[in-house]
Amino acid sequence: LQEKIEEIAAKYKHLVVKKCCYDGVRINHDETCEQRAARISVGPRCVKAFTECCVVASQLRANNSHKDLQLGR
């Protein structure tokens, strides 16, 4: 997960945009990525970075938990 997110974040050379990506990675079981992104007011660049990283992180976590289930963990 960390490697993949670092790969995505490396594209963003504006520090705030990069940090928007990292914010998207934070675990939040109560809201979807879209719901969380809707509260962002600093600009579309932040929304895009947040959403991309949030979705990727959610997918990777889902895949990992699915693998854990298959392995009977």
């Epitope: 050379k13 705030v16 579309p44």
Partner: antibody, heavy 118, light 111 residues
């Protein structure tokens, strides 16, 4: 209407520090990044750094080698730029500006003249 | 850092003529179809004023005689026709990445 109002002119001795303020009004202060630029007499614009007041995130121009510190007071909607170890080459007009959509500077302060002289 | 090189450093134009200023970036300032190049006008004793953002979008209240174009590393600001009040310094600026950088400026004088 959006306004950025800066503090008044300063005259400083070499080696001292200066702290310039930039009071924002007419918009939600925490929604936009505040940048600081400077312009030496007869010269172009030099970017110094910025702060995102909502999170306190900052980034600085490495040319200033740790001499610059940018802070923000959300309670008063004011951003500050402090420059230390002043030298004569720091004599310039210092500007704050609001960055809209992480793309462009749509509003600027009126500028603060800082003169460094012994 | 992205270095922005403006040319010419100065130019004198007669009223009614066209003024063209170019800005060349040391690397592309485009990202996923968006251009992060902006232009500002600065008159003596005043702060810079936004003219054009994202290469070609006029800020509100800016006269239509100002226009911007370009992509990648090469950008142009055009004033056509030039008016006496356009005497000023003009700066390009990129916001794609930190550090934000400005061109060295172009001084436009009206003959």
């Amino acid at each position: 209407q959006v306004q950025l109002v800066q503090s008044g002119a300063e005259v400083k001795k070499p080696g001292s520090s200066v702290k310039v303020s930039c009071k924002a009004s007419g918009y939600t202060f925490t929604d936009h990044i505040i940048h600081w630029m400077r312009q030496a007499p007869g010269q172009g614009l030099e970017w110094m750094g910025y702060i995102y007041p909502r999170e306190g995130w900052t980034n600085y121009n490495e040319n200033f080698k740790g001499r610059v510190t940018i802070t923000a007071d959300k309670s008063t909607s004011t951003a500050y730029m402090e420059l230390s170890s002043l030298r004569s080459e720091d004599t310039a007009v210092y500007y704050c500006a609001r960055e809209r959509n992480l793309e462009y500077f749509d509003y600027w302060g009126q500028g603060t003249t800082v003169t460094v002289s012994s | 850092d992205i270095v922005l090189t403006q040319s010419p450093a100065s130019l004198a134009v007669s009223p009614g003529q066209r003024a063209t200023i170019t800005c060349k970036a040391s690397q592309s300032v485009d990202y996923e179809g968006d251009n992060y190049m902006n232009w500002y006008q600065q008159k003596p004793g005043q702060p810079p004023k936004l003219l054009i953002y994202a290469t070609s979008n006029l800020d509100s209240g800016v006269p239509a005689r100002f226009s911007g174009s370009g992509s990648g590393t090469d950008f142009t600001l055009t004033i056509n026709p030039v008016e006496a009040e356009d005497t000023a310094n003009y700066y390009c600026q990129q916001s794609l990445e930190d550090p934000h950088t400005f061109g060295g400026g172009t001084k436009v004088e009206i003959k």
